[in-house]
Amino acid sequence: ALDAAYCFRNVQDNCCLRPLYIDFKRDLGWKWIHEPKGYNANFCAGACPYLWSSDTQHSRVLSLYNTINPEASASPCCVSQDLEPLTILYYIGKTPKIEQLSNMIVKSCKCS
Amino acid sequence: ALDAAYCFRNVQDNCCLRPLYIDFKRDLGWKWIHEPKGYNANFCAGACPYLWSSDTQHSRVLSLYNTINPEASASPCCVSQDLEPLTILYYIGKTPKIEQLSNMIVKSCKCS
């Protein structure tokens, strides 16, 4: 799996999970979230050569097409596969509110 | 939806469905498929600017992060959303065999 266990341990030009820390205030302009101040969102990036973690038959077809037609612009792309939620704490007036924001953290990647 | 109805009618630099005809023999080196000789596989390509058909909260975070940090390499990517199967005819000796290959045709796209 193209997850932290594999990608953070190997220098990998191909599609892999990359570390990315998001600071809510600085990076998104959100001042209202009390905790956390930011989080490890991560992101997916890298080349998708023939059969590198292909997600569907179509992405396999594309990567094969690309191998035979290297000048073509049609190629698979490295995107998130498994995502996890993030729990945040904010205030409605003086009242604390805990909420779970779905699909905020990327755990693994795929070529799609 | 970033599908043929929208994308093939509009000149769109942003993430959209693009036409791509795959000739099995020429483009994939597959000589064994009897019918069809090729098919409209299509593919997804184009920029994923802020809020352009974002797929998940994470892709929204990335596009927002990218707006505030335009030099960043972390950005969403245009990939397939809805896929359809393709029915093919091939021969096992003299015996015709009809098979459905899943997820071969891209019908719409998303920023993920």
Epitope: G29, W30, Y90, G93, K94, L101 | -
Partner: antibody
């Protein structure tokens, strides 16, 4: 510049529903809470609730709970407020207003022009 | 809910007058070292306009003749020298407690 443009006036019968829209421009729509405030003719201001467009998180005034739904369409930077089971005392001007961004519940720095909703049989 | 009581409900004044409007909250709106009290101006047929936020901070573009003060439960909006364009209704608003609530308004009329 920041602008909030609301949909036009509506006349509704008691028991019906109304959906008011508010199209935002000139700022990052998903980064600010959007509030809805109403004002009955000749009366003061009454806060109805708010929505965070990024996640769809909402916080409604209990007085309207069960009758109001706030939604957003991030692709068009538009906020919506739907009020159901309308009564004659729901006749008011309805405003969308952007929170200034320091807190979820906050002061409001930009307001729409208002939408008059008249409930009459 | 926090009740907001404004006084007076209306007042008549002349151009150049110093005008003071008060707002009393039914409980303290102070926490985290801030007073969660704001002031708006509304003219007939128009949307409210933010003047002062967090009790004493002047909103960008608002003339300096407007000022706000107070803490806890008692707050004041002052117009140091009333101008013709200042004749309007003024509202206070708290966001220390859910739901957010407004005062009943103070109408400033020409004497």
């Amino acid at each position: 510049q920041v602008q909030l443009v609301q949909s036009g006036a509506e006349v509704k019968k008691p028991g019906a529903s109304v959906k008011v829209s508010c199209k935002a421009s000139g700022y990052t729509f998903t980064s600010y809470w959007m509030n809805w405030v109403r004002q009955a003719p000749g009366q003061g201001l009454e806060w109805m609730g708010q929505i965070f467009p990024f996640s769809g998180s909402t916080n409604y005034n209990e007085m309207f709970e069960g009758r109001v739904t706030m939604t957003t369409d991030t692709s068009t930077s538009t906020a919506y407020m739907e009020l159901r089971s309308l009564r004659s005392d729901d006749t008011a001007v309805y405003y969308c207003a952007r929170g200034i961004g320091n807190y979820a519940l906050d002061a409001m720095d930009y307001w729409g022009q208002g939408t008059l909703v008249t409930v009459s049989s | 809910d926090i009740q907001m009581t404004q006084s007076p409900s209306s007042l008549s004044a002349s151009v150049g007058d110093r005008v003071t409007i008060t707002c009393r909250a039914s409980e303290s709106v102070d926490f985290w070292g801030n007073s969660f009290m704001h002031w708006y101006q509304q003219k007939p047929g128009k949307a409210p306009k933010l003047l002062i936020y967090l009790a004493s901070n002047l909103e960008s573009g608002v003339p300096s003749r407007f000022s706000g003060s107070g803490s806890g439960t008692d707050f004041t909006l002052t117009i140091s020298s009333l101008q013709p364009e200042d004749f309007a209704t003024y509202y206070c608003q708290q966001n220390a407690e859910d739901p957010l609530t407004f005062g009943g308004g103070t109408k400033v009329e020409i004497k």
